[in-house]
Protein backbone atom coordinates (compact mmCIF):
# COMPACT_ATOMS: atom_id res chain seq x y z
CA UNK A 1 0.00 0.00 0.00
CA UNK A 2 0.99 3.91 -0.15
CA UNK A 3 3.10 4.85 2.63
CA UNK A 4 0.96 7.60 4.64
CA UNK A 5 1.52 11.02 3.81
CA UNK A 6 -0.73 12.45 7.38
CA UNK A 7 -1.07 10.37 10.75
CA UNK A 8 -3.99 10.59 13.11
CA UNK A 9 -4.33 12.60 15.70
CA UNK A 10 -1.71 11.53 18.77
CA UNK A 11 0.45 9.87 15.82
CA UNK A 12 3.56 11.64 14.03
CA UNK A 13 5.12 10.30 10.38
CA UNK A 14 8.69 8.95 10.53
CA UNK A 15 10.40 6.78 7.73
CA UNK A 16 6.88 6.52 5.67
CA UNK A 17 4.93 4.76 8.67
CA UNK A 18 2.70 6.27 11.51
CA UNK A 19 3.93 5.70 15.09
CA UNK A 20 2.39 6.85 18.33
CA UNK A 21 3.35 9.54 20.15
CA UNK A 22 4.26 9.11 24.14
CA UNK A 23 1.30 10.40 26.25
CA UNK A 24 2.03 13.27 28.69
CA UNK A 25 4.61 12.62 31.19
CA UNK A 26 6.59 10.22 28.74
CA UNK A 27 9.36 10.80 26.72
CA UNK A 28 10.66 8.42 23.81
CA UNK A 29 13.09 6.42 23.68
CA UNK A 30 12.56 4.36 20.53
CA UNK A 31 10.13 5.05 17.36
CA UNK A 32 8.13 2.08 16.12
CA UNK A 33 9.12 0.31 13.27
CA UNK A 34 7.13 -2.06 11.60
CA UNK A 35 6.81 -4.75 13.61
CA UNK A 36 7.25 -2.78 16.94
CA UNK A 37 5.41 -0.48 19.04
CA UNK A 38 6.89 3.20 20.30
CA UNK A 39 8.50 2.99 23.12
CA UNK A 40 8.40 5.58 25.95
CA UNK A 41 9.67 6.18 29.13
CA UNK A 42 8.47 7.67 32.12
CA UNK A 43 9.73 11.33 33.21
CA UNK A 44 12.29 11.33 35.85
CA UNK A 45 11.60 12.96 39.02
CA UNK A 46 11.95 17.16 38.50
CA UNK A 47 10.87 16.62 35.27
CA UNK A 48 7.99 16.98 32.95
CA UNK A 49 6.12 16.69 29.65
CA UNK A 50 2.59 18.02 29.17
CA UNK A 51 1.77 17.02 25.81
CA UNK A 52 1.58 14.29 23.43
CA UNK A 53 5.37 14.15 22.11
CA UNK A 54 8.29 12.68 20.11
CA UNK A 55 10.76 13.89 22.47
CA UNK A 56 13.96 12.57 23.43
CA UNK A 57 14.35 14.52 26.75
CA UNK A 58 11.66 15.22 29.53
CA UNK A 59 11.95 19.25 30.66
CA UNK A 60 13.72 20.19 33.58
CA UNK A 61 10.75 21.76 36.36
CA UNK A 62 11.51 25.30 37.22
CA UNK A 63 13.15 26.31 39.96
CA UNK A 64 11.94 28.90 42.26
CA UNK A 65 14.97 30.35 43.60
CA UNK A 66 14.03 31.70 47.19
CA UNK A 67 16.94 34.82 46.64
CA UNK A 68 14.98 35.86 43.55
CA UNK A 69 11.89 36.12 46.73
CA UNK A 70 10.09 33.45 44.59
CA UNK A 71 8.29 30.69 46.54
CA UNK A 72 6.52 26.94 45.22
CA UNK A 73 2.95 27.78 43.97
CA UNK A 74 2.03 24.43 42.63
CA UNK A 75 4.53 21.63 42.86
CA UNK A 76 5.32 20.09 39.80
CA UNK A 77 4.31 16.46 38.58
CA UNK A 78 5.68 14.15 35.65
CA UNK A 79 3.00 16.14 33.21
CA UNK A 80 3.00 19.90 34.65
CA UNK A 81 5.83 22.58 35.74
CA UNK A 82 6.29 24.14 39.00
CA UNK A 83 4.65 27.01 39.44
CA UNK A 84 6.37 29.85 41.18
CA UNK A 85 5.11 33.12 43.03
CA UNK A 86 6.04 35.77 45.02
CA UNK A 87 6.65 35.84 48.83
CA UNK A 88 3.99 37.68 50.88
CA UNK A 89 4.73 41.63 50.42
CA UNK A 90 6.28 41.29 46.84
CA UNK A 91 5.04 40.67 43.49
CA UNK A 92 6.45 39.02 40.40
CA UNK A 93 8.61 40.82 37.73
CA UNK A 94 6.58 39.23 34.48
CA UNK A 95 4.19 36.81 34.11
CA UNK A 96 5.88 33.87 34.53
CA UNK A 97 7.17 35.42 37.32
CA UNK A 98 11.03 35.22 37.24
CA UNK A 99 11.66 37.13 39.81
CA UNK A 100 9.73 39.49 42.83
CA UNK A 101 10.05 43.09 43.87
CA UNK A 102 8.52 45.06 46.67
CA UNK A 103 5.32 45.62 46.28
CA UNK A 104 5.63 49.77 45.99
CA UNK A 105 4.10 52.16 48.68
CA UNK A 106 1.75 55.27 47.49
CA UNK A 107 3.62 58.61 48.35
CA UNK A 108 2.16 61.35 50.55
CA UNK A 109 -0.53 62.81 48.33
CA UNK A 110 -0.85 59.31 46.70
CA UNK A 111 -3.34 56.57 47.69
CA UNK A 112 -3.86 53.19 47.03
CA UNK A 113 -6.33 52.90 44.31
CA UNK A 114 -5.48 48.68 44.11
CA UNK A 115 -3.47 46.55 46.96
CA UNK A 116 -0.89 44.62 44.93
CA UNK A 117 -1.30 41.21 44.71
CA UNK A 118 1.19 38.40 44.52
CA UNK A 119 1.10 39.00 40.19
CA UNK A 120 0.31 42.85 40.01
CA UNK A 121 2.10 45.80 41.68
CA UNK A 122 0.19 48.73 44.35
CA UNK A 123 -1.62 51.12 42.28
CA UNK A 124 -1.54 54.47 43.16
CA UNK A 125 -3.62 57.31 42.47
CA UNK A 126 -3.41 60.98 43.14
CA UNK A 127 -5.69 61.97 46.23
CA UNK A 128 -8.94 64.37 44.57
CA UNK A 129 -9.84 67.99 45.60
CA UNK A 130 -11.75 67.38 49.42
CA UNK A 131 -9.35 64.19 49.73
CA UNK A 132 -5.85 63.69 51.66
CA UNK A 133 -2.73 61.21 51.93
CA UNK A 134 0.35 61.82 54.61
CA UNK A 135 1.67 59.01 54.62
CA UNK A 136 3.87 56.77 52.40
CA UNK A 137 1.78 53.24 52.58
CA UNK A 138 1.04 50.24 50.28
CA UNK A 139 -2.25 49.98 51.50
CA UNK A 140 -3.63 53.23 52.94
CA UNK A 141 -6.72 54.76 50.50
CA UNK A 142 -6.75 58.38 50.15
CA UNK A 143 -8.84 59.99 53.01
CA UNK A 144 -11.68 62.54 52.91
CA UNK A 145 -10.92 65.64 54.98
CA UNK A 146 -12.66 66.34 58.36
CA UNK A 147 -15.94 68.38 57.87
CA UNK A 148 -15.95 70.94 60.33
CA UNK A 149 -19.10 71.82 60.06
CA UNK A 150 -20.35 68.56 61.35
CA UNK A 151 -18.40 69.08 64.18
CA UNK A 152 -20.01 73.06 64.56
CA UNK A 153 -16.16 73.96 63.94
CA UNK A 154 -15.02 76.28 61.09
CA UNK A 155 -11.99 76.05 58.75
CA UNK A 156 -8.88 77.35 60.34
CA UNK A 157 -6.67 76.01 57.73
CA UNK A 158 -7.55 74.37 54.31
CA UNK A 159 -6.71 70.69 53.76
CA UNK A 160 -4.19 69.69 50.79
CA UNK A 161 -3.73 66.12 49.08
CA UNK A 162 -1.07 65.23 52.15
CA UNK A 163 -2.51 66.92 54.85
CA UNK A 164 -6.22 67.26 56.52
CA UNK A 165 -7.91 70.73 56.78
CA UNK A 166 -7.57 72.19 60.77
CA UNK A 167 -10.67 73.43 62.50
CA UNK A 168 -11.24 75.35 65.40
CA UNK A 169 -14.05 76.94 66.91
CA UNK A 170 -16.22 79.93 65.60
CA UNK A 171 -16.00 83.24 66.57
CA UNK A 172 -18.77 84.41 68.20
CA UNK A 173 -19.79 88.39 68.59
CA UNK A 174 -19.98 89.69 71.77
CA UNK A 175 -23.46 91.01 72.36
CA UNK B 1 16.11 28.01 20.72
CA UNK B 2 16.34 28.37 16.89
CA UNK B 3 14.66 30.81 14.76
CA UNK B 4 13.40 30.04 11.50
CA UNK B 5 15.90 31.24 8.19
CA UNK B 6 15.20 34.88 7.62
CA UNK B 7 15.73 36.15 4.24
CA UNK B 8 15.81 39.03 1.82
CA UNK B 9 12.27 41.18 1.71
CA UNK B 10 10.96 43.73 0.20
CA UNK B 11 9.50 47.15 1.02
CA UNK B 12 5.84 46.98 2.18
CA UNK B 13 6.75 42.75 2.70
CA UNK B 14 5.65 40.92 5.78
CA UNK B 15 8.17 39.05 7.77
CA UNK B 16 7.18 35.86 9.58
CA UNK B 17 10.10 34.15 11.82
CA UNK B 18 9.43 31.23 14.32
CA UNK B 19 11.39 30.32 16.75
CA UNK B 20 11.56 26.25 17.91
CA UNK B 21 12.33 25.63 21.85
CA UNK B 22 13.42 22.33 22.95
CA UNK B 23 14.31 20.40 26.01
CA UNK B 24 11.90 23.20 27.90
CA UNK B 25 8.60 24.21 27.79
CA UNK B 26 7.13 27.38 25.95
CA UNK B 27 3.77 27.66 28.42
CA UNK B 28 6.30 28.11 31.22
CA UNK B 29 8.17 30.47 30.10
CA UNK B 30 8.16 34.39 29.03
CA UNK B 31 9.81 34.58 25.53
CA UNK B 32 10.98 37.85 23.80
CA UNK B 33 12.41 39.18 20.40
CA UNK B 34 14.99 40.83 20.37
CA UNK B 35 16.63 42.51 17.17
CA UNK B 36 19.59 43.72 16.06
CA UNK B 37 20.22 46.41 13.32
CA UNK B 38 24.12 46.12 11.40
CA UNK B 39 26.54 47.54 13.57
CA UNK B 40 23.44 48.70 16.34
CA UNK B 41 22.63 47.94 19.42
CA UNK B 42 20.05 45.43 20.64
CA UNK B 43 16.62 46.91 20.25
CA UNK B 44 13.34 44.82 22.13
CA UNK B 45 10.75 44.61 19.97
CA UNK B 46 8.32 42.54 21.95
CA UNK B 47 7.15 39.48 23.86
CA UNK B 48 4.57 36.88 24.99
CA UNK B 49 3.86 35.90 28.64
CA UNK B 50 4.13 32.21 30.76
CA UNK B 51 0.23 33.05 30.55
CA UNK B 52 0.01 34.40 27.28
CA UNK B 53 -0.34 37.68 27.18
CA UNK B 54 1.04 39.77 24.27
CA UNK B 55 3.88 42.94 25.25
CA UNK B 56 5.31 45.43 22.24
CA UNK B 57 7.39 48.30 22.13
CA UNK B 58 5.38 51.44 21.10
CA UNK B 59 7.29 51.41 17.55
CA UNK B 60 6.32 48.01 17.15
CA UNK B 61 2.89 47.68 18.21
CA UNK B 62 1.07 48.15 15.60
CA UNK B 63 2.52 46.07 12.45
CA UNK B 64 3.92 43.33 15.21
CA UNK B 65 1.94 39.73 16.46
CA UNK B 66 3.53 37.40 18.48
CA UNK B 67 1.76 34.44 18.92
CA UNK B 68 3.03 30.82 20.36
CA UNK B 69 2.14 27.11 19.33
CA UNK B 70 2.17 25.51 22.69
CA UNK B 71 1.75 22.10 20.83
CA UNK B 72 4.97 22.69 18.73
CA UNK B 73 6.51 24.54 21.17
CA UNK B 74 7.06 26.96 18.44
CA UNK B 75 6.99 31.09 19.16
CA UNK B 76 6.05 33.43 16.00
CA UNK B 77 7.14 36.73 14.97
CA UNK B 78 4.86 38.42 12.38
CA UNK B 79 5.72 42.04 11.29
CA UNK B 80 3.77 43.64 8.62
CA UNK B 81 5.09 46.99 6.15
CA UNK B 82 8.46 45.95 6.28
CA UNK B 83 10.96 49.29 5.34
CA UNK B 84 14.70 48.92 4.82
CA UNK B 85 14.82 49.76 8.89
CA UNK B 86 13.86 46.81 9.19
CA UNK B 87 16.99 45.33 8.20
CA UNK B 88 18.36 43.59 11.32
CA UNK B 89 19.36 40.18 12.96
CA UNK B 90 16.32 38.81 15.05
CA UNK B 91 16.86 36.93 18.03
CA UNK B 92 14.35 34.75 19.59
CA UNK B 93 14.86 34.60 23.85
CA UNK B 94 13.98 33.17 26.41
CA UNK B 95 12.62 35.31 29.70
CA UNK B 96 11.28 38.79 30.14
CA UNK B 97 14.59 40.81 31.63
CA UNK B 98 16.23 37.83 32.13
CA UNK B 99 17.33 36.27 28.60
CA UNK B 100 18.88 33.15 29.73
CA UNK B 101 18.90 31.51 26.46
CA UNK B 102 19.33 33.03 23.03
CA UNK B 103 18.78 32.02 19.73
CA UNK B 104 21.93 32.36 17.00
CA UNK B 105 19.43 34.90 15.65
CA UNK B 106 18.27 35.52 11.89
CA UNK B 107 19.23 38.22 8.77
CA UNK B 108 16.26 39.59 7.57
CA UNK B 109 17.50 42.31 4.84
CA UNK B 110 14.94 44.91 3.67
CA UNK B 111 15.62 46.35 -0.12
CA UNK B 112 14.05 47.06 -2.99
CA UNK C 1 9.08 52.70 26.88
CA UNK C 2 12.15 52.51 29.10
CA UNK C 3 14.98 54.17 27.98
CA UNK C 4 18.30 53.16 29.21
CA UNK C 5 21.36 55.22 29.07
CA UNK C 6 24.81 53.54 28.99
CA UNK C 7 28.43 54.62 29.48
CA UNK C 8 29.89 56.31 26.28
CA UNK C 9 31.96 53.80 24.05
CA UNK C 10 35.20 53.01 24.30
CA UNK C 11 35.79 52.53 27.45
CA UNK C 12 39.32 51.11 28.06
CA UNK C 13 41.29 49.24 31.04
CA UNK C 14 44.22 47.07 30.89
CA UNK C 15 44.99 43.01 32.11
CA UNK C 16 44.25 42.75 35.25
CA UNK C 17 42.45 45.96 35.79
CA UNK C 18 39.14 46.94 35.97
CA UNK C 19 36.74 48.76 34.43
CA UNK C 20 33.02 50.24 35.16
CA UNK C 21 30.01 50.72 33.12
CA UNK C 22 26.81 52.85 34.51
CA UNK C 23 23.02 52.27 33.45
CA UNK C 24 20.69 54.74 34.43
CA UNK C 25 16.80 53.94 33.78
CA UNK C 26 14.37 57.05 32.83
CA UNK C 27 11.90 54.96 35.42
CA UNK C 28 12.44 53.19 38.68
CA UNK C 29 12.95 49.46 37.83
CA UNK C 30 13.57 48.35 41.26
CA UNK C 31 15.97 45.68 40.64
CA UNK C 32 14.83 44.48 37.48
CA UNK C 33 17.91 45.26 35.62
CA UNK C 34 19.96 42.15 33.32
CA UNK C 35 23.91 42.73 32.37
CA UNK C 36 24.38 41.17 28.92
CA UNK C 37 27.76 40.48 26.95
CA UNK C 38 28.09 40.26 23.05
CA UNK C 39 31.21 39.15 21.09
CA UNK C 40 30.85 40.07 17.61
CA UNK C 41 29.07 37.24 14.98
CA UNK C 42 27.54 35.94 18.44
CA UNK C 43 24.08 36.38 20.09
CA UNK C 44 24.29 38.13 23.50
CA UNK C 45 25.59 36.22 26.52
CA UNK C 46 23.45 36.58 30.65
CA UNK C 47 26.17 37.83 32.79
CA UNK C 48 23.63 39.46 35.87
CA UNK C 49 20.28 39.17 36.34
CA UNK C 50 17.98 41.14 39.12
CA UNK C 51 20.84 43.78 39.16
CA UNK C 52 23.10 41.77 41.45
CA UNK C 53 22.86 38.02 40.80
CA UNK C 54 25.19 36.08 38.70
CA UNK C 55 23.98 34.12 35.65
CA UNK C 56 25.20 30.32 35.62
CA UNK C 57 28.92 29.72 34.39
CA UNK C 58 29.57 33.47 35.02
CA UNK C 59 33.24 34.16 36.79
CA UNK C 60 32.78 36.27 40.30
CA UNK C 61 34.92 39.13 38.49
CA UNK C 62 31.35 40.08 36.99
CA UNK C 63 29.95 42.65 39.45
CA UNK C 64 25.89 43.79 39.73
CA UNK C 65 24.83 46.89 41.53
CA UNK C 66 22.60 49.39 42.34
CA UNK C 67 18.57 49.41 42.45
CA UNK C 68 15.58 51.98 41.31
CA UNK C 69 17.40 54.06 38.40
CA UNK C 70 20.98 53.29 39.14
CA UNK C 71 23.20 50.57 37.82
CA UNK C 72 26.65 49.50 37.84
CA UNK C 73 28.69 46.57 36.07
CA UNK C 74 31.92 46.12 37.07
CA UNK C 75 34.07 43.92 35.53
CA UNK C 76 37.72 43.28 37.59
CA UNK C 77 40.93 41.06 36.46
CA UNK C 78 40.45 42.35 33.27
CA UNK C 79 41.07 39.24 30.40
CA UNK C 80 42.09 39.70 26.93
CA UNK C 81 38.52 37.72 26.66
CA UNK C 82 36.57 40.09 28.10
CA UNK C 83 36.37 42.52 25.26
CA UNK C 84 33.25 42.79 23.93
CA UNK C 85 29.82 45.14 23.80
CA UNK C 86 27.94 45.18 27.42
CA UNK C 87 24.11 45.70 26.98
CA UNK C 88 22.31 46.81 30.41
CA UNK C 89 18.32 45.76 29.81
CA UNK C 90 16.20 46.62 32.24
CA UNK C 91 12.00 46.35 32.47
CA UNK C 92 8.93 46.17 34.64
CA UNK C 93 5.89 44.23 34.71
CA UNK C 94 2.19 44.97 36.78
CA UNK C 95 -0.48 43.99 34.55
CA UNK C 96 -1.38 43.31 30.71
CA UNK C 97 -1.38 47.48 30.61
CA UNK C 98 1.29 48.30 32.90
CA UNK C 99 4.92 47.15 31.61
CA UNK C 100 8.23 48.56 30.50
CA UNK C 101 11.13 47.04 28.41
CA UNK C 102 14.20 48.19 26.54
CA UNK C 103 18.09 48.12 25.96
CA UNK C 104 20.82 50.43 26.83
CA UNK C 105 22.58 51.26 23.71
CA UNK C 106 25.83 49.11 24.60
CA UNK C 107 29.07 49.77 25.86
CA UNK C 108 32.45 48.39 24.27
CA UNK C 109 34.87 47.59 26.16
CA UNK C 110 38.46 47.41 25.12
CA UNK C 111 41.41 45.53 27.38
CA UNK C 112 44.56 47.02 26.38
Known amino acids: PEPPTACREKQYLINSQCCSLCQPGQKLVSDCTEFTETECLPCGESEFLDTWNRETHCHQHKYCDPNLGLRVQQKGTSETDTICTCEEGWHCTSEACESCVLHRSCSPGFGVKQIATGVSDTICEPCPVGFFSNVSSAFEKCHPWTSCETKDLVVQQAGTNKTDVVCGPQDRLRA | VKESEGGLFKPTDTLTLTCTASRFSLSSYDMSWVRQAPGNGLEWIGAIGGAGGTYYASWAKSRSTITRNTNLNTLTLKMTSLTAADTATYFC?????????WGQGTLVTVSS | DIVLTQTASPVSGAVGGTVTINCQSS??????LSWYQQKPGQPPKLLIYAASNLASGVPSRFKGSGSGTEFTLTISDLECADAATYYC??????????FGNGFGGGTEVVVK
Open chain 3, 27 to 32: EDISSN
Open chain 3, 89 to 98: QGGYWSGISN
Open chain 2, 93 to 101: ARGWTRLDL
